[in-house]
């Protein structure tokens, strides 16, 4: 079945490379496993960012390497990607998978445009 | 639950045609995205072809003018008719659900695009050969 996901359409990155985002979505049951998924979409490809899964009501867990971090509440996810750089510059896609108990669940979101800017570097003081 | 089912593979030489359908139950889905995907021996899976609620239709450009893709809403079936096979053809066929409409038409453009589908039939093997 599918579900409406939805997210912010532009956010700006801090100037040390962080980018915070809500990815909300309409659960039409009661989900108690729900894995979600940063996709990033630019020059015509499509990447995955990072994923975890998680039990309604505790906190998600990525791997120890990834650039994200997040917290869930209800329906709704606060994601944080971190180490942004202007290359990163991009379309951040939340997906969203109810994975139990089933019937599976899939939404996508319309995208987040994360922009990134690299900080100026300090001039040399004389 | 969702389940799709491909059907119409099978081994043809190389100018022939086959016709692929994809028959789905469980899920009401004429209001979203519905494509064609093939992954080749060693290779990653790749889209073919996507057609939206409103019937508009986008080709990879390695199908373009060969391959025709269609869909039935009252018996809940997608059809890819293949005309000219190559032997570059040669694939297993997948036909997916994408949920959201906004990823449907630049699909076959995008490399990776199946990160945007779900619900994944089991798949048909279309082998040319002569």
């Known amino acids: 079945k599918a579900m409406h996901v939805a997210q912010p359409a532009v956010v700006l990155a801090s100037s040390r490379g962080i980018a915070s985002f809500v990815c909300e979505y309409a659960s039409p049951g009661k989900a108690t496993e729900v894995r979600v998924t940063v996709l990033r979409q630019a020059d015509s490809q499509v990447t995955e960012v990072c994923a975890a899964t998680y039990m309604m009501g505790n906190e998600l867990t990525f791997l120890d390497d990834s650039i994200c971090t997040g917290t869930s509440s209800g329906n709704q996810v606060n994601l944080t990607i971190q180490g942004l750089r202007a290359m990163d510059t991009g379309l951040y896609i939340c997906k969203v998978e109810l994975m139990y108990p089933p019937p599976y669940y899939l939404g996508i979101g319309n995208g987040t445009q994360i922009y990134v800017i690299d900080p100026e570097p300090c001039p040399d003081s004389d | 639950e969702v389940q799709l089912v491909e059907s119409g593979g099978g081994l043809v030489q190389p100018g022939g045609s086959l016709r692929l359908s994809c028959a789905a139950s469980?899920?009401?889905?004429?209001?979203?995205?519905l494509g064609w995907f093939r992954q080749a021996p060693g290779k990653g899976r790749e889209a073919v072809s996507t057609?939206?609620?409103?019937?508009?239709?986008s080709y990879a450009d390695s199908v373009k003018g060969r391959f025709t893709i269609s869909r039935d809403n009252a018996k809940n079936t997608l059809y890819l008719q293949m005309n000219s096979l190559r032997p570059e053809d040669t694939a297993v066929y997948y036909c997916?659900?994408?949920?959201?409409?906004?990823?449907?038409?630049?699909?076959?453009?995008?490399?990776?695009?199946?990160?945007?589908?779900?619900?994944w039939g089991q798949g048909t093997l279309v082998t040319v050969s002569s």
């Open positions: 469980g899920y009401t889905y004429s209001r979203h995205c």
């Open positions: 057609i939206s609620s409103g019937g508009s239709t």
């Open positions: 997916a659900i994408g949920p959201n409409p906004r990823y449907c038409s630049g699909a076959p453009a995008t490399r990776g695009a199946e990160h945007y589908f779900g619900y």
